[in-house]
Every structure is written in C-alpha cells, then in structure tokens.
C-alpha cells in the first residue's frame, strides 16, 4: 500500500514521506508531553 497522496514523481514521494515523518515526530512529542503532564 501507499498512504501518501498518489504522485508520479519520486522526489515528491520522498518529500511526502519526509513531511509525514516530521508530523509523526511532532505529534509523538506532543503525546509524550501530555502523558508526562497528567
């Protein structure tokens, strides 16, 4: 499967994965912070 937006450009695909990785890191940090604050 590919859950990135479909693209026929390999560099755009890599960019999408980089954005997804960044968002996952940011959201992961926020989640950890919330758990810590509870």
């Amino acid at each position: 499967h590919s859950d990135g937006i479909f693209t026929d450009s390999y560099s755009r695909y890599r960019k999408q994965m980089a954005v997804k990785k960044y968002l996952a890191a940011v959201l992961g940090k926020r989640y950890k912070q919330r758990v810590k604050n509870k």
Epitope: S9, S11, Y13
Partner: antibody, heavy 117, light 112 residues
Framework: EVQLVQSGAEVKKPGSSVKVSCKAS????????MHWVRQAPGQGLEWMGL????????RYAQKFQGRVTITADESTSTAYMELSSLRSEDTAVYYC??????????WGQGTLVTVSS | DIVMTQSPDSLAVSLGERATINCKSS???????????LNWLQQKPGQPPKRLIY???TRESGVPDRFSGSGSGTDFTLTISSLQAEDVAVYYC?????????FGGGTKVEIK
C-alpha cells in the same frame, strides 16, 4: 559504509512464490528507501518497487502490482520481496538497492531465482 | 512510462581512446525540485551494478575523473575520456524522476 546482504539462490516451480531477503548494515535502515530491481539472464534492469520502512509505505511498478509484496522488519534491518504466481519469465537475478540522493548508491549482491518445472 | 533509449548497443574502443554513450528519455527528466535525476551505472560480468554518476554529472566517490556525465532535459551523455582495460563493462542510464523508475537497455563497452 552501507552493506546489503541478500539470501541465497532459489529454484521454484511455476505457480509458486519466492521470498528474497536483504539485510542492511552500516546505515539508517528505517529512514532509507529500499528498492528491488531484477535482471533476467543476459538482459537489462527492471524496477519492481520500493518500501520506506518507517511507515511500511510501498510503491510498485504497475507490471508487478498484485503479484509482488515488499515488506520490512525494522528490528532486524531486513527487507523482503515476495513474488507470487511465478512463471519461467521470472527467472532472473533479484537485487535490493538503497537510495541516497535519488539514486541507488548501494546494491545487494543479487539473488538468482530460477523458475523451472 | 518513460522510455530510456541508449545508443549504441555496443562499442569497441582502443585503449586510451574516448568512449561516448548516449541516453535519450521520452520525457524531460527535470523535476519540480529543479534537479534532474539521471544516473549512470556500471556493471561488470557476474557483479551487481555500481553507481557511477548521479544527478547527471556528479561522480560517485572513488570513480576516476575520466568518467563524466553531461546533458539536460531529455538528452544525456556518458563519456570515458581515455578508456582503460578495467572499464570493460555494460553501462546503463536510468531515471529516478518519475514512477516507475526506468532503465536504458545498456551499452556494452569493449576494447578494440
């Protein structure tokens, strides 16, 4: 230095499946794009697909869609390529390759898959 | 799919002479990020391919400077300025701009 070590040669019957492994060392496996490319005897190179292990996100060449499955095990830094419904035309050397700079910087040694009845 | 056409299919060159391989793509390989993902591989008998040149003209580290790549858009060239015995191999161009990634048919370089 990144190293890719592939599993050994296989002989398969038509209609069966084969699963080839590719173990990476010396790099950040999860954050690399692992590709599979094949080369039929005396022929050129053909791209089959890729996986981005962090998200197990895959892209396949249309030609192999539905017949190929690429997976990755982050805990062992190993990628797998499974090809089903094998036919004689699938006899080839299968390579894994890691992309850096939008190009295949490192290649496995290749795995010969022979499909014969 | 983008078709990569290499010429010639084979090439016999004397030691120390220049070898030129051409590669033509059916569409421009200039990407929206401003880069052109045209690469060259070298494959010796019984060995996996090896990256030679990427992004049209960037030599892989350790690759001798007799190898050079040039071109833009749809037309590209690999030049070996002074052929050495160890350069006998098959050379492939391939594009990493568009899915599916596609390869040229290869050019076999031999010594005359």
């Amino acid at each position: 230095e990144v190293q890719l070590v592939q599993s050994g040669a296989e002989v398969k019957k038509p209609g069966s499946s084969v699963k080839v492994s590719c173990k990476a060392s010396g790099g950040t496996f999860s954050d690399s794009y692992m590709h599979w490319v094949r080369q039929a005897p005396g022929q050129g190179l053909e791209w089959m697909g890729l996986i981005y292990p962090i998200f197990a996100d895959t892209r396949y060449a249309q030609k192999f869609q539905g017949r190929v499955t690429i997976t990755a095990d982050e805990s062992t830094s190993t990628a797998y390529m499974e090809l089903s419904s094998l036919r004689s035309e699938d006899t080839a050397v299968y390579y894994c390759a890691i992309d850096y700079d939008g190009s295949f910087a490192y290649w496995g040694q290749g795995t010969l898959v022979t499909v014969s009845s | 799919d983008i078709v990569m056409t290499q010429s010639p299919d084979s090439l016999a060159v004397s030691l120390g002479e220049r070898a030129t391989i051409n590669c033509k793509s059916s569409q421009s390989l200039l990407d929206s990020d401003g880069k052109t993902y045209l690469n060259w591989l070298q494959q010796k008998p019984g060995q996996p391919p090896k990256r030679l040149i990427y992004l049209v003209s960037t030599r892989e580290s350790g690759v001798p400077d007799r190898f050079s790549g040039s071109g833009s858009g749809t037309d590209f060239t690999l030049t070996i300025s002074s052929l050495q015995a160890e350069d006998v191999a098959v050379y492939y161009c391939w594009q990493g701009t568009h899915f599916p990634l596609t390869f040229g048919g290869g050019t076999k370089v031999e010594i005359k």
